[in-house]
């Protein structure tokens, strides 16, 4: 998990989240997303 401090004086936490593709479809493999401030953005 990476943590970045910004000039605004608060910290934004970045966390990689990994999901299995077959949980949401028929593909195999992993889906990697990025959660920033509690919201998955990718």
């Amino acid at each position: 998990d990476a943590e970045f401090r910004h000039d605004s004086g608060y910290e934004v936490h970045h966390q990689k989240l990994v999901f299995f593709a077959e949980d949401v479809g028929s593909n195999k493999g992993a889906i990697i997303g990025l959660m920033v401030g509690g919201v998955v953005i990718a």
């Epitope: 999901f19 299995f20 593709a21 077959e22 949980d23 949401v24 992993a30």
Partner: nanobody, 124 residues
């Protein structure tokens, strides 16, 4: 929820191998993605590897990629972690966990069932 019981830990020399097993009780085993985490003395519990419900998909932490292999046998309700080329830094208690489908498999909070852990010590 499933009950989990790990086995297979022990003392091994650097470069050696171990195979951990995690036996699950309950008819819902194949509803869960299964993962292995580990916790070294004085450190937090960290993700090691996970396998999908079908066993088709796997994912590994960078620190174990190419050395560890996770697999599952849904007929036996068991998950395995084959650990090769072991290093002293692999020393930890290894925990098996069950994560319901659709949850992130690399974070501890996704797992609602845990075993009691099995100790792996890599030392000469």
């Amino acid at each position: 929820e499933v009950q989990l019981l790990e086995s297979g830990g022990g003392l091994v020399q650097p470069g050696g191998s171990l195979r951990l097993s995690c036996a699950a009780s309950g008819r819902t085993f194949n509803n869960y993605n299964m993962g292995w985490f580990r916790q070294a003395p004085g450190k937090g519990r960290e993700f090691v590897a996970a396998v999908s419900r079908s066993g088709v998909s796997t994912y590994y932490a960078d620190s174990v990629k190419g050395r560890f292999t996770i697999s599952r046998d849904n007929a036996k309700n068991t998950v395995y972690l084959q650990m090769n080329s072991l290093r002293p830094e692999d020393t930890a208690i290894y925990y098996c966990g069950a994560a319901y489908r659709g949850t992130a498999i690399n974070v501890r909070r996704s797992y609602d069932s845990w075993g009691q852990g099995t100790l792996v010590t890599v030392s000469s």
